[in-house]
Interface confidence: medium
């Protein structure tokens, strides 16, 4: 049998059974998550679960820009440094940039400082680009 690769929505890119949408619009973290959800298919702000996934995403985004941070689906809802993925994925792979995670910074972004391969925490009300993900 021929195994067909599932198709993503127009403009979204496919990698390892997932579709990703890079939104070059300014949204705070919660509005970004709501916009991801509005696309259905169980879409959320993206979870990044391996270095391979991180590298693919980073390469794609670098084709557009190299200076703006991007919201991902990692947050600290209890504000106790207990980070979790909004889509329910296991928080095993970690790629923090090593910066201080104190203060009122309870949402995670892909940092442009290391070509989007590492994450930083930031204030959730900041308006930034964002990355959505769903499984087709």
């Amino acid at each position: 049998d021929i195994i067909m690769r599932p198709s993503c929505a127009p403009g979204w890119f496919y990698h390892k059974s997932n579709c990703y949408g890079y939104f070059r619009k300014l949204r705070n973290w919660s509005d970004a998550e709501l916009e991801c959800q509005s696309y259905g298919n169980g879409a959320h702000l993206a979870s990044i679960l391996s270095l391979k996934e991180a590298s693919t995403i980073a390469e794609y985004i670098s084709g557009y820009q190299r200076s703006q941070p991007i919201w991902i689906g990692l947050h600290d809802p209890q504000k106790r440094q207990q980070w979790q993925w909004i889509d329910g994925a296991m928080y095993l792979y970690r790629s923090w940039s090593g910066k201080s995670m104190g203060g009122n910074k309870h949402c995670a972004e892909m940092s442009s400082n290391n070509n989007f391969l590492t994450w930083s925490s930031n204030e959730c009300n900041k308006r930034q680009h964002f990355l959505c993900k769903y499984r087709p």
Partner: antibody, heavy 127, light 109 residues
């Protein structure tokens, strides 16, 4: 009052050069990215080039890359477009435009909308 | 990619008109869309930015929206007035460039 005033247009032969200027007033010029947009007679708008507030980043449409150079002198509140190797298809009204900035967010130059436009200057390339 | 707009649209005063702008490839939702009005003999004016935001001074008769299903943006003008006549351009951006639609000529009958 926020104002942009272009000058330097005129008639030039194919292969010739021209430098357009855009004098800005009424705002802190160095804080804003700027663009040149052109409009051929009876045609639509075509973005030509953009420059960041500091002048450190510049961007060009493929149609003018290597022939046109955008620059700015923040001490004189003036934007420039140096146009070399001009062609008949460069004939157009050239507008300078300011890029709007919201909330002090340091954002990519060309992503901002253009909220203030000059009155335009006509460049005619013909022999 | 390209932004495609209808060449011309006509409507009577007081009516509502919707101008469309369709993106040929890539998602219309990924990048902000702006709309510019250009009255005859004048410079362009920004009437909608960031998909649906109105600059101060632009009447609330002007509204913008995005439809990811049709991959298009729309500019709706209600209570059409004679001074609304002119060309309307949608605009978005791509990797290091601004992209304009071809423009729609709006005639108020």
């Amino acid at each position: 009052e926020v104002q942009l005033l272009e000058s330097g247009g005129g008639l030039v032969q194919p292969g010739g050069s021209l430098r357009l200027s855009c004098a800005a007033s009424g705002f802190t010029f160095s804080s804003y990215a700027m663009s040149w947009v052109r409009q051929a007679p009876g045609k639509g708008l075509e973005w030509v080039s953009a420059i960041s507030g500091s002048g450190g980043s510049t961007y060009y449409a493929d149609s003018v890359k290597g022939r046109f150079t955008i620059s700015r002198d923040n001490s004189k509140n003036t934007l420039y477009l140096q146009m070399n190797s001009l062609r008949a298809e460069d004939t157009a009204v050239y507008y300078c435009a300011r890029h709007y900035q919201s909330g002090g967010y340091v954002y990519i130059t060309f992503y901002y909308p253009m909220d203030v436009w000059g009155q335009g200057t006509l460049v005619t390339v013909s022999s | 990619f390209m932004l495609t707009q209808p060449h011309s649209v006509s409507e009577s005063p007081g009516k509502t008109v919707t101008l469309s702008c369709t993106r040929s490839s890539g998602s219309i939702s990924f990048d902000y869309v702006q709309w510019y009005q250009q009255r005859p003999g004048s410079s362009p004016i920004l009437v909608i930015f960031e998909d649906d935001q109105r600059p101060s001074g632009v009447p609330d008769r002007f509204s913008g929206s995005i439809d990811s299903t049709s991959n298009s943006a729309s500019l709706t003008i209600s209570g059409l007035q004679s001074e609304d006549e002119g060309d309307y351009y949608c605009q978005t951006y791509d990797d290091n460039r601004q992209v304009f639609g071809g423009g729609t000529k709006l005639t108020v009958l």
